[in-house]
């Protein structure tokens, strides 16, 4: 029953004279495992015999013996699966039918597998992608039908004859489906590839040479060109005449069209592959190419840079920058359109030609006021030199410089006197805007840089105004100098430095505490009458009738001022004391009587003492000594003493006479 | 005030050399130019050599090559070196100042010396 024979191989193995060959195969016997397997080469079924005929190349018996002369062919298969064949070395005449004879305890089956040995080792076959573009990675295959383990081979990739670079990555199968050698190369042709050689070639373990196979490369590619100028270095004066040729070294397809371009940009009715300019203008200046299209598309030529040389155009100057503040820097670029670049450059300012400066740029570390004006430039090449341009304005803007604070008034300048100052200065850039005083205070500004100060104190000192613009510069303070009378004049007593007694040695002190002028005159006045005319009033021993209100005054040339009053206070002891007697000192008894005891002290007295005729001291002790009723006993003279911090005083005696009255007499 | 005093002329044999000096003081401007004018007998003053602030130097062409001038800050000295001297360069050398640019009439120059005769002869 042949349907359990199920077997699995490659159809045709393919080897050469003194190779091998290496069949992978597998089979399934359904029924049992194998008992008798014959390798026969080229068999013929024999109908009468029933068995096949043919070279045995191999035979099992059930023994598992296997002949000596078999040694040559292997069966490396087993008994239910398995039924790889290796031949080694194999032979031209064992081309043809390999026949596999397989019996079972039951079944048996004969299959049949193709051998292909030549004579010498067959080239491999080397496989292009249908179109190769230049630049564009392609991959190359070259493919052999052999492969064996005994028997190495190599497959090495030549370019004209010349081992490629690139590495190829090499791969073998030897499966039931497929029995090859490969090789992949990855390549990116160039142009300069198209039409060459490529081959690959079979060698031997040793690298001996065993076979080849070989193609041409057909690199599609856009035009390669080569670009000829007359003048060789594209270098003409205005005027002059340029031919350009362009030569195609190499298209694939062939070309179509030709044009030519000028700074990349196509240039109109130029379509022949020469170019023709005639009385080149400096506009002419730029980068030539030709460019040529194919099917793959177009290809342009290097560039050819065609120097059109003029001498200097009217030159421009730029600033960098302007308006520059004073101190910063400054840099002048003289700009002038000349083929070759100019070599040397001529400078103005305002006019004059600037000497030693020669160069493109002017750089000004430290830019200072006189640095403001016109600058402009000539520039100068080989060809001749150019004009000067309408050239550019440098503004250096710096503060207000040499500001003054200027009093405007005659003087001297007297303390109430309106004082105007003005603030002037000598040049500013740009134009002063506003002003600025020191003090501040509530002074009008009449107009823009005077000041109008009312009624001026005579502590209005120094004043400084600044200038401003985009800065403010502060002037040197200006001294008004203004001119008072003398100022808080005050009387100060210098001595006794404690309280005044009676005739103690006195001094006053007439001070004050500015003057302006600094001359001055003392007056000193008491009740309206001169004392003196010196800083100081001096009594040698005071006396209480010094006392009183005392001013002093201090006078300059602009006027006069006069101190507080004030009090000079004289402490003495109780004086001029006296004993009043009210009614009178003669008094009818009964009535009342009063005496009183007066007297000048200071301070006041504040402790009296009475006596009588007898010096006995009477138990009385305040200013007034009050009887009633009077009685006749107290006929007689009294006297009293007074006390103050000072000391005691005592009065003469006054003598009180009392009376009968006219009831006494008539009793009598 | 400014002040410059020249210094270092003379008569000298054709092709021979010679330094003058001029002393600057009371100079107190920031940005100046210095320079050697000549003044040959029945002529008129012409520009020699000068030498700005920041160093920057031009000689007149019948010079280049032959004279070279100098300034020594720390001295507030100017020097002009002349090499292979010429009948032709036989005239009074003078120094001169002025605040700003370097310019080539003498009539921009504010500040003068009292010059220097330089005579050579062949």
């Known amino acids: 029953d042949s349907s359990k024979w199920v077997f699995e191989h490659p159809e045709t193995l393919y080897a050469w004279e003194g190779a091998c060959v290496w069949i992978p195969c597998t089979y399934r016997a359904l029924d049992g495992d194998l008992e008798s397997f014959i390798l026969f080469h080229n068999p013929e079924y024999n109908k009468n015999t029933s068995k096949f005929d043919g070279t045995r190349l191999y035979e099992s018996t059930k023994d598992g013996k296997v002949p000596s002369e078999q040694k040559r062919v292997q069966f490396l298969g087993d008994k239910n699966k398995n039924c790889t064949l290796s031949i080694h070395p194999v032979h031209l005449n064992d081309s043809g039918q390999l026949g596999l004879r397989m019996e079972s305890k039951t079944e048996k089956w004969m299959e049949r597998i193709h051998l292909n040995v030549s004579e010498r080792p067959f080239p491999p076959h080397i496989q292009l992608p249908p179109e190769i573009q230049e630049s564009q990675e392609v991959t190359l295959t070259c493919l052999l039908n052999f492969s064996c383990y005994g028997y190495p081979i190599q497959l090495q990739w030549l370019l004209e004859g010349v081992p490629m670079r690139q590495a190829a990555v090499t791969s073998t199968s030897l499966t039931i489906k497929s029995v090859f050698t490969r090789s992949e190369l990855k390549f990116s042709p160039q142009w300069s590839h198209h039409g060459k050689i490529v081959t690959c070639q079979l060698q031997d373990a040793d690298g001996k040479f065993l076979s080849n196979d070989t193609v041409q490369l057909n690199v599609k590619h856009t035009p390669k060109l080569e670009i000829k100028v007359t003048p060789s270095d594209a270098i003409v004066r205005e005027g002059d005449s340029v031919t350009m040729t362009c030569e195609v070294s190499s298209s694939n397809p062939e070309y179509t069209t030709v044009s030519w371009l000028k700074d990349g940009t196509s240039l109109k009715k130029q379509n022949t592959f020469t170019l023709n300019l005639r009385e080149v203008t400096k506009d002419q200046s730029g980068k030539y190419c030709c460019q040529v299209s194919n099917d793959v598309g177009p290809g342009r030529s290097e560039e050819v840079f065609l120097q059109v040389q003029y001498a200097p155009e009217p030159s421009t100057v730029q600033i960098l920058h302007s308006p520059a503040v004073e101190g910063s820097q400054v840099e002048f670029l003289c700009m002038s359109l000349a083929n070759p670049l100019p070599t040397n450059y001529t400078w103005y300012h305002n006019g004059k030609e600037m000497q030693g400066r020669t160069e493109e740029k002017v750089h000004i570390p430290k830019i200072l006021p006189w640095h403001a004006g016109t600058y402009s430039c000539v520039a100068e090449n080989i060809l001749g030199t150019g004009q000067r341009g309408p050239g550019a304005e440098l503004d250096v803007q710096y503060p207000p410089k040499k500001v003054t604070t200027v009093i405007q008034n005659p003087m001297p300048i007297r303390e109430g006197d309106t004082v105007t100052l003005s603030c002037n200065y000598n040049s500013s850039n740009p134009s002063v805007t506003r002003y600025e005083w020191k003090p501040h205070g509530a002074w009008e500004e009449p107009s823009l840089g005077v000041l109008k100060i009312q009624n001026v104190g005579w502590d209005n000192t120094t004043i400084a105004c600044a200038a401003c613009n985009s800065w403010c510069s502060w002037a040197s303070p200006v001294a008004l100098n203004v001119q008072y009378a003398p100022r808080d004049v005050r009387v100060r007593k210098i001595k006794p430095l404690s309280e005044i007694h009676s005739g103690n040695s006195v001094s006053l002190q007439c001070d004050f505490s500015s003057s302006h002028p600094k001359e001055v005159q003392f007056f000193w006045e008491k009740n309206g009458r001169l004392l003196g005319k010196e800083s100081q009033l001096n009594f040698d021993s005071i006396s209480p009738e010094d006392a009183g209100s005392y001013s002093c005054w201090v006078n300059n040339s602009i006027g006069q001022t006069a101190s507080k009053a004030w009090t000079l206070e004289v402490l003495y002891a109780p004086r001029r004391l006296r004993v009043s007697m009210s009614p009178g000192d003669q008094v009818m008894e009964g009535k009342s009587a009063t005496l009183t005891c007066e007297s000048d002290a200071n301070p006041p007295v504040s402790h009296y003492t009475w006596f009588d005729w007898n010096n006995q001291s009477l138990p009385y002790h305040s200013q007034k000594l009050r009887l009633e009723p009077v009685k006749v006993q107290h006929s007689g003279a009294y006297w009293c003493q007074g006390t103050n911090s000072v000391g005691k005083g005592r009065s003469p005696l006054s003598t009180l006479t009392v009376y009968y009255s006219p009831e006494t007499i008539g009793r009598r | 005030e400014v002040q410059l005093v020249e210094s270092g002329g003379g008569s000298v044999q054709s092709g021979g050399s010679l330094r003058l000096s001029c002393a600057a003081s009371?100079?107190?401007?920031?940005?100046?130019?210095l320079a050697w004018f000549r003044q040959a007998p029945g002529k008129e003053r012409e520009r020699v050599a000068t030498?700005?602030?920041?160093?920057?130097?031009s000689y007149a062409d019948s010079v280049k090559g032959r004279f070279t001038i100098s300034q020594d800050n720390t001295k507030n000295t100017l020097y002009l070196e002349m090499n292979t001297l010429k009948p032709e360069d036989t005239a009074m050398y003078y120094c001169a100042a002025r605040g700003g640019w370097c310019y080539s009439l003498s009539k921009e120059y504010n500040y003068w010396g009292q010059g220097t005769q330089v005579t050579v002869s062949s």
């Open positions: 009371g100079y107190t401007y920031r940005g100046y130019c």
């Open positions: 030498i700005d602030s920041d160093g920057y130097i």
